[in-house]
Interface confidence: medium
């Protein structure tokens, strides 16, 4: 008995989840255990992505989706999809190519991730620093000297780090 | 998709102003640091100026400290760059960029499609 | 002058494998990303961090870095990989936040 081909077709008529099996006469089966399709009419089922180190499973696999990851505790995705997995470093500090290192006098970082940047310099806009600038965090500019009442004083911002060589975002 | 659309650029005298403007769109404006980069005819890139997500942080190169000044509205999902005492080494494709970071290093992922300045008498 | 220096120029004959550095003292502590730039358009991001391609650019472009010196390699370049490269990285000095190479053109014979 030899099949008609119609002129659609009859992969197309397979819906996610199944795969048209050319060895059993272009049947939609079932994807088997561990393999997806996200789409109909396709004739492979795709393997699921395995989480596994330092990637954890944010979503289970199913036969019509792939499985997500995310970042075991410490680490933070990167790239579409999460494809990678990048260390932590502590708030105040930045990933360098020998691990997390301190942000150099004169910058900061308020997250866990991205790079140490330079403190505001307030008297670029002719403000002054109401609060200095800590390893964590900016500093907070606040009106200029001259906006303040007579007695008032203002903290003197630090000279500027010649080497601010650490920043994030 | 995202998208940085540029606008304001033209020819200024030298001494003029001259406001650049950046609107983003088909990502989360204010979720990002934003750049202004330049590239004086046949030359190299040049990075001018960042600001952070918010607003608050902000940092330049020498050689616009004092004349040029980001700022951001993320309500309207746009960057801009006031120019003023422009000179004629000014002259230059200005460039807007949204900054990421991965893989330890500051990218500029995606791109406005650059906006010629001009300045002279 | 740049604090990230390229050669001004190479070529590379079809199909064969062209390689770039950039060289700079902040790159001891951190790693580059790099671009391909085309006349009269806006830069495009091909590679960051050790060896990271942003979806869409072909697996022929990738990265290395040792030392004070980040590498782009193309291997089998093709006539539309003709083009400037410029790395980018953060500058060691205060000067500026952020600098560029000084740009290498790729040519493809």
């Known amino acids: 008995f030899e099949r008609t081909r119609s002129l659609q077709d009859p992969c197309s008529n397979c819906p996610a989840g199944t795969f048209c099996d050319n060895n059993r006469n272009q049947i939609c089966s079932p994807c088997p255990p561990n393999s997806f399709s996200s789409a109909g009419g396709q004739r492979t089922c795709d393997i699921c992505r395995q989480c596994k180190g330092v990637f954890r499973t944010r979503k289970e696999c199913s036969s019509t989706s792939n499985a997500e990851c995310d970042c075991t505790p410490g680490f933070h995705c990167l790239g579409a999809g999460c494809s990678m997995c990048e260390q932590d470093c502590k708030q105040g500090q930045e990933l360098t190519k020998k691990g997390c290192k301190d942000c150099c006098f004169g910058t900061f970082n308020d997250q866990k991730r991205g790079i140490c940047r330079p403190w505001t310099n307030c008297s670029l806009d002719g403000k002054s620093v109401l609060v200095n600038g800590t390893k964590e965090r900016d500093v907070v500019c606040g009106p200029s000297p001259a906006d303040l009442s007579p007695g008032a004083s203002s903290v003197t911002p630090p000279a500027p780090a010649r080497e601010p060589g650490h920043s994030p975002q | 998709e995202v998208q940085l659309v540029q606008s304001g650029g033209g020819l200024v005298q030298p001494g003029g102003s001259l406001r650049l403007s950046c609107a983003a769109s088909?990502?989360?404006?204010?979720?990002?640091?934003m750049n202004w980069i330049r590239q004086a005819p046949g030359k190299g890139l040049e990075w001018l100026s960042y600001i952070s997500s918010g607003g608050s942080t902000i940092y330049y190169a020498d050689s616009v400290k004092g004349r040029f000044t980001i700022s951001r509205d993320n309500a309207k999902n746009s960057l801009y760059l006031q120019m003023n005492s422009l000179r004629a080494e000014d002259t230059a494709v200005y460039y807007c960029?949204?900054?990421?970071?991965?893989?330890?290093?500051?990218?500029?992922?995606?791109w406005g499609q650059g906006t010629l300045v001009t300045v002279s008498s | 002058s740049s604090e990230l220096t390229q050669d001004p120029a190479v070529s590379v004959a079809l199909g064969q494998t062209v390689r770039i550095t950039c060289q700079g003292d902040?790159?001891?502590?951190?790693?580059a990303s790099w671009y391909q730039q085309k006349p009269g358009q806006a830069p495009v991001l091909v590679i960051y961090?050790?060896?990271n391609r942003p979806s869409g650019i072909p697996d022929r472009f990738s990265g290395s870095s040792s030392r004070n010196t980040a590498s782009l390699t193309i291997t089998g370049a093709q006539a539309e990989d003709e083009a400037d490269y410029y790395c980018n990285s953060r500058d060691s000095s205060a000067n500026h936040f952020y600098v560029f190479g000084t740009g290498t053109k790729v040519t493809v014979l």
């Open positions: 902040s790159l001891r502590s951190y790693y």
């Open positions: 961090g050790k060896n």
């Open positions: 088909g990502f989360t404006f204010s979720d990002y640091y």
């Open positions: 960029a949204r900054e990421d970071y991965g893989g330890n290093s500051v990218l500029f992922d995606y």
